[in-house]
């Protein structure tokens, strides 16, 4: 807390300019009017204030706006945003995408801080849903943003916003998140033709159920192994050798390199060795001929 002291004669700030960098902390406190600072916030960013001086400027704004800053000030905070705490940001009402972009720009190149996470949360909650423009903006700054949301939060994403999602935005999503996003993507891309549809839906297939994979296997899609390896284990296991062969097309040869990795390993173990042999890849570990194939999972769940 800076002590209240009178401003020395002739030092009263008429505007926010570079002369203020030579002011001591107490002089800034005494000589800069908070209302003037608020109206000229856009100038602060261009002036090389020290961290200590920025603390004083923040303190002045906090006194002027104890219930939270207005958006006209927030939009021009610049580096002063880095001084804000999540508690400060929770008092704000940010509605403009331009304001959001301006503040994200300040944090660009750094990991998502608690301040940024709070800002985004406030912004999205204020809008009621994660619309396409917002999602475009957020994933441009933070490619992993979508995967940082809980399945509950993702449920508010409208299918129309899915068009903004790039493959790299889904890299760190887990199965529960893809379970939510996949049906939305399916809905969003439903009017596309076969090959175009597959290009768009491919990144979301980690949430696809078995029946959708079976349907894709009938469409000559030639799924690559990287995509296949990210499919849900429970969705892959019921697929027959013939279905996997059709699904992967020429990429089926890649199964050999992945035979010790999941979900390929789990899938191989469930296939008859005779059927695996038809692929001509030398895949081993299938059910020997003459073995009774038992799926007791339902029976065990009921008992």
């Amino acid at each position: 807390e800076v002590e209240k002291t009178a401003c020395p004669s002739g030092k009263k700030a008429r505007e926010i300019d570079e002369s203020l960098i030579f002011y001591k902390k107490w002089e800034l406190e005494a000589c800069v009017d908070a209302a003037l600072l608020a109206t000229q916030m856009d100038r602060v960013n261009a002036i090389p204030f020290t961290y200590e001086q920025l603390d004083v400027l923040k303190h002045k704004l906090d006194e002027l706006y104890p219930q939270g800053y207005p958006e006209s000030v927030i939009q021009h905070l610049g580096y002063l945003f880095l001084k804000m705490s999540p508690e400060d940001i929770r008092k704000w009402n940010v509605t403009s995408l331009e304001t959001l972009k301006a503040l994200l720009e300040v944090n660009k190149g750094h990991e998502m801080s608690p301040q940024v996470a709070t800002l985004i949360d406030r912004f999205v909650k204020g809008r009621g849903q994660l619309d396409k423009d917002t999602l475009d903006t957020l994933t441009a700054f933070y490619p992993g943003y979508l995967c940082s949301l809980s399945p509950e939060e993702l449920s508010s994403v409208p299918p129309s916003s899915i068009w903004a999602v790039r493959p790299q935005d889904l890299d760190t999503c887990d199965p529960r998140q893809l379970d939510v996003l996949y049906p939305k993507a399916r809905l969003a891309f439903q009017n596309m033709n076969g090959s175009e549809y597959f290009v768009k839906i491919q990144s979301f297939l980690g949430g696809a159920p078995t029946e959708d994979l079976k349907a894709l296997s009938q469409q000559n899609v030639s799924m690559d192994l990287a995509t296949f390896m990210k499919l849900r284990t429970d969705a892959v296991l019921p697929l027959t050798v013939a279905e996997v062969q059709k699904l992967l097309g020429p990429h089926v040869e890649g199964l050999k390199a992945e035979e010790r990795h999941r979900p390929v390993r789990d899938w191989i173990l469930r296939q008859r060795q005779d059927d695996l042999d038809t692929l001509g890849l030398g895949l081993q570990g299938g059910i020997p001929n003459g073995y009774l194939v038992l799926d007791l999972s339902m029976q065990e769940a009921l008992s």
Partner: antibody, heavy 119, light 106 residues
């Protein structure tokens, strides 16, 4: 409710073969959702996966132990077994049998049995 | 084999604290990562599977997340019964465990 119980000698002499059996009760080994697993834990240390077997007889072993390990399954007795040959004092550990669900993880464990290798 | 590097090896905390344990895989393992809790003289129990799914019967204060090859177990508010050792395990290929993290009373 599936339960697992390890059994076998608690003391084995160096160079001999360690043999343990895990009895599965309350469920079937003949289930394509599970791997029947052996894991060990050296005193005061972390966990080490030894290997597992599928009901069809397919086995997977830890590469560092592969030359000495055999895991087998007897579906009629609802048991699976571990044999570890040419043991040394470094094989002294608590040995656990466990069930790995392909959809989740090691969801059922035996209580563990301490095997000491000493002459 | 895939190496799992777990940190810290031990930590001291108080009841009510938020506790975070991390595990890094030496290569991509997709979401094939599980977390276990082990109390002295007992077998481990499964807490989290597939990186972030809560095993049936496990309290919701436990959660898991993934960022690339980095995985995190979080206990939102530590309870007296949570003082134990925690292990991560990858099951993408031949399973391997992290070295473990012992959560002790501060």
């Amino acid at each position: 409710q599936v339960q697992l119980q390890e059994s076998g000698p608690g003391l084995v002499k160096p160079s001999q073969t360690l043999s343990l059996t895990c009895t599965v009760s309350g469920g079937s080994i003949n289930n394509n959702n599970y791997y029947w697993t052996w894991i060990r834990q050296h005193p005061g240390k972390g966990l080490e996966w030894i290997g597992y077997i599928y009901y069809s007889g397919s086995t997977f072993y830890n590469p560092s132990l592969k030359s000495r390990v055999t895991i087998s399954v007897d579906t009629s007795k609802t048991q699976f077994s571990l044999k570890l040959s040419s043991v040394t004092a470094a094989d002294t550990a608590v040995y656990y049998c466990a069930r790995e669900d392909t959809m989740t993880g090691l969801d059922v464990w035996g209580q563990g049995t301490l095997v000491t290798v000493s002459s | 084999d895939i190496q799992m590097t777990q940190s810290p090896s031990s930590l001291s905390a108080s009841v009510g604290d938020r506790v975070t344990i991390t595990c890094r895989a030496s290569q991509s393992i997709n979401n094939y990562l599980n977390w276990y809790q082990q109390k002295p003289g007992k077998a481990p129990t499964l807490l989290i599977y597939a990186a972030s799914s809560l095993q049936s019967g496990v309290p919701s204060r436990f959660s898991g997340s993934r960022s690339g090859t980095d995985f995190t177990l979080t206990i939102s508010s530590l309870q007296p019964e949570d003082f134990a050792a925690y292990f991560c395990q990858q099951t993408y290929s031949n399973p391997t465990f992290g070295q473990g993290t012992k959560v002790e009373v501060k």
